[in-house]
Amino acid sequence: ILGGREAEAHARPYMASVQVNGEHLCGGVLVAEQWVLSAAHCLEDAADGKVQVLLGAHSLSQPEPSKRLYDVLRAVPHPDSRPDTIDHDLLLLQLSEKATLGPAVRPLPWQRVDRDVEPGTLCDVAGWGIVSHAGRRPDRLQHVLLPVLDRATCNRRTHHDGAITQRMMCAESNRRDSCKGDSGGPLVCGGVLEGVVTSGSRVCGNRKKPGIYTRVASYAAWIDSVLA
């Protein structure tokens, strides 16, 4: 997260760290007791490493009573996701067992009504992604509030030049932004999961290159079918 601040510890109990061989790779969001939603491209970066999900964490390195690392029973990328595009960039991870719920571990309600968030709405994005252009990684969860940007502006030539579909949404990126390592994490508007950070190799913090988020409401049928 660029231009953000440290999150209040355990105030986002839905927050997950998707890890490979014990290292943070991507964000994720607990959407059901045994399921974490993330970004499909995160799996590409995992190669053949062991994928696990850390729940109940604030610090990645320090011991915390609520922290627990879960193995992944099943990884289900969206069937239409492709390495060369950010379309359908969603991944569902089934944990090896149901998560132990508590104040620091709780699923987040996700948007099922397929309606755009009003441009200008402030939404919260959180993650353990880099906090500087130099690539500094934080140990503790960071967050930032970002205004939603309308799709017509986001599709302008010097922004994303027509690449933003109805199934994506954008948020402003003027110095405050999601960045590398935040992919798969949640964009939360009014206490509801609206978007998942896409995992393209986008320049961060440049106002002309808004953050791109996959709209979960657009994938309600797929999410329900996998979770069923």
Epitope: D150, R151, A152, T153, N155, R157, G162
Partner: antibody, heavy 116, light 112 residues
Framework: QIQLVQSGPELKKPGETVKISCKAS????????MNWVKQGPGKGLKWMGW????????TYADDFKGRFAFSLETSASTAYLQISNLKNEDTATYFC?????????WGQGTLVTVSA | DVLMTQTPLSLPVSLGDQASISCRSS???????????LEWYLQKPGQSPKLLIY???NRFSGVPDRFSGSGSGTDFTLKISRVEADDLGVYYC?????????FGAGTNLELK
């Protein structure tokens, strides 16, 4: 497939008003801004500005501030260009052009002739 | 405004020839994001312009590989390796990096 279909040619007198339409199909209208480009007879292309089809906010190039107005009828996926107090130098073909990627999608053009 | 100067304004060719059109901008048109939004369009008589090349050298979908774009800073070139009858028309360079976006005056590619 993506199409922009413009209204037919117009013959107007100086001082009158003309309103040109551009109906979009094959994509979600609100997701891509609409530009307007002027081409005088035997002349080159000049960008007039654009309208944000999501918010309805127009942006005009300096030479097209005042007598020119962009508007929308979103429910009909249609953009409009209105030119008031027409002058002889407004005689031109006017194109609507969708944003993204580049200017890949153009209307067929509407010829406006201003003559006494 | 950024002035786009094309040369030549008229280019007589024979079919099968290589054609080269130059475009010079009055300002460096690299955008703050590192991209150069330099595009080339072809307008045939009585038709709307068509996008050929974007970001200096990328061919738009369906554009034959006879067309290639190059350049940086303020100097850009469009090359057509073997001119076909379907290539005749007016070619415009365009910059989208600075508002207002601007077109060159056009180069008419015609038969000798």
């Amino acid at each position: 497939q993506i199409q922009l279909v413009q209204s037919g040619p117009e013959l107007k007198k100086p001082g009158e008003t003309v309103k040109i339409s551009c109906k979009a199909s094959g994509y979600i209208f609100r997701n891509y801004g609409m530009n307007w480009v002027k081409q005088g007879p035997g002349k080159g292309l000049k960008w007039m500005g654009w309208i944000n089809t999501y918010t309805g906010e127009p942006t005009y190039a300096d030479d097209f501030k005042g007598r020119f107005a962009f508007s929308l009828e979103t429910s009909a996926s249609t953009a409009y260009l209105q030119i008031s107090n027409l002058k002889n130098e407004d005689t031109a073909t006017y194109f609507c052009v969708r944003d993204g990627p580049g200017f890949a999608y153009w209307g067929q053009g509407t010829l406006v002739t201003v003559s006494a | 405004d950024v002035l786009m100067t094309q040369t030549p304004l008229s280019l007589p060719v024979s079919l099968g020839d290589q054609a080269s059109i130059s475009c010079r901008s009055s300002l460096i048109i690299e955008h703050s994001d590192g991209n150069t939004y330099l595009e080339w369009y072809l307008q045939k008589p009585g038709q709307s312009p068509k996008l050929l090349i974007y970001k200096v050298s990328n061919r738009f979908s369906g554009v034959p590989d006879r067309f290639s774009g190059s350049g940086s800073g303020t100097d850009f070139t469009l090359k057509i390796s073997r001119v076909e009858a379907d290539d005749l028309g007016v070619y415009y360079c365009f910059q989208g990096s600075h508002v207002p976006v601007t077109f060159g005056a056009g180069t008419n590619l015609e038969l000798k």
